[in-house]
């Protein structure tokens, strides 16, 4: 599998989507999981609901949701309130049994916020009919990691 | 009606190269995967792989890994299984058969009539 | 690799009897298994899957039930037809096993 990778600005959400065969995956749940180390477990960060039919509706666990689109076969991971911390290589799998396939190999980069070292005066403020959470918009930028590129940097 | 209808039983010798097909017919080819399994003379069943030939991703069991080689060919739906060299021990009956994915569970639910291949010198 | 055992290997039941067939998992499969009928020089029938789901067009008299590592086939009433071997296969775990066959006989 090819690594994706999504960036992200810190204290933005940050959108990842998961294209699949949704007749290759029919009736299986979907995860979202972290890759611990290079060749370590991927440690289930959270997974679609129990049953496959309400795989629709969007769970949470902590600041991340996911949510799978069956019949378009895309399952979206939203990361809200993104943190230095999330970076990392994360997997998107389909689950039967005790078997999990990668659909998609995800590395997420966090970004530091522009805004974080600005004078007040060079901010913008919403209008007063508006807030902080109905301009605010999620980003996210995808790409396909190079030949030769390693998603985890050497261990010394 | 689906159906899976296989090719004609073999005689080969030891060293030989087979290739048997499974030609799917009445609903999606591309949509479900195909399994293979096989059955020596007055033995039980054993898994050996499957394959889905929307993307021709192919698994094994690890008792078949680089034993044979399943591949489709979309086109004219349909699945093959084959050897490179022959052993006599590969001597057996070889059914294909479609894996039905669902909410209850998945089935191998309709099957080849299987094809005999009898390796012997 | 997961290990099916079936129970008895041989049964042998008189016409319209109940014919009860084990198959245990050497660890837990779920209820990711199916139950299948062959009779000689045929194909295998799909009979049950999820472990308790009944095949299109089997009939009422074939019932399974278990989950985990223990499940039984009941035939409720075994019918001339019935006669034949029957084998359970789990898919919870790669590869997918078969059990070694329960052969079912006229006693």
């Known amino acids: 599998h090819n690594t994706t990778v999504f960036q992200g600005v810190a204290g933005q959400s940050l959108q990842v989507s998961c294209p699949y065969d949704s007749m290759k995956h029919w009736g299986r749940r979907k995860a979202w999981c972290r890759q611990l180390g290079e060749k370590g477990p991927c440690q289930r960060v959270v997974s679609t609901h129990n049953l496959w039919l309400l795989s629709f509706l969007r769970r949470w666990n902590g600041s991340t949701a996911i949510t799978d689109d069956t019949l378009g076969g895309t399952l979206t991971i939203t990361l809200r309130n993104l943190q230095p911390h999330d970076a990392g290589l994360y997997q998107c799998q389909s689950l039967h049994g005790s078997e999990a396939d990668t659909l998609r190999k995800v590395l997420v980069e966090v970004l530091a916020d522009p805004l974080d070292h600005r004078d007040a005066g060079d901010l913008w403020f919403p209008g007063e009919s508006e807030s902080f959470e109905d301009a605010h918009v999620e980003h996210s930028i995808s790409r396909s990691l190079l030949e030769g590129e390693i998603p985890f940097p050497p261990t010394s | 009606e689906v159906q899976l209808v296989q090719s004609g039983a073999e005689v080969k010798k030891p060293g030989e190269s087979l290739k048997i097909s499974c030609k799917g017919s009445g609903y999606s080819f591309t949509s479900y995967w195909i399994g293979w399994v096989r059955q020596m003379p007055g033995k039980g069943l054993e898994w050996m792989g499957i394959i889905y030939p929307g993307d021709a991703d192919a698994r094994y069991s690890p008792s078949f890994q680089g034993q044979v080689t399943i591949s489709a060919d979309k086109s004219i739906s349909t699945a093959y299984l084959q050897w490179s060299s022959l052993k006599a021990s590969d001597t057996a009956m070889y059914f294909c058969a479609r894996r039905r994915q669902g909410i209850f569970g998945d089935a191998l639910d309709f099957w080849g009539q299987g094809t005999l291949v009898t390796v012997s010198s | 690799e997961i290990v099916m055992t079936q129970s008895p290997a041989t049964l042998s039941v008189s016409p319209g009897e109940r014919a009860t067939l084990s198959c245990r998992a050497s660890?837990?499969?779920?209820?990711?298994l199916a139950w299948f009928q062959q009779k000689p020089g045929q194909a295998p029938r799909l009979l049950i899957y999820g472990a308790s789901t009944r095949a299109t067009g089997i009939p009422a008299r074939f019932s399974g039930s278990g989950s985990g590592t223990e499940f039984t086939l009941t035939i409720s009433s075994l019918q001339p037809e019935d006669f034949a071997v029957y084998y359970c296969?789990?898919?919870?775990?790669?590869?997918?096993?078969f059990g070694q066959g329960t052969k079912v006989d006229i006693k």
């Open positions: 660890q837990s499969v779920s209820s990711n």
């Open positions: 296969l789990q898919d919870n775990n790669f590869p997918p096993t």
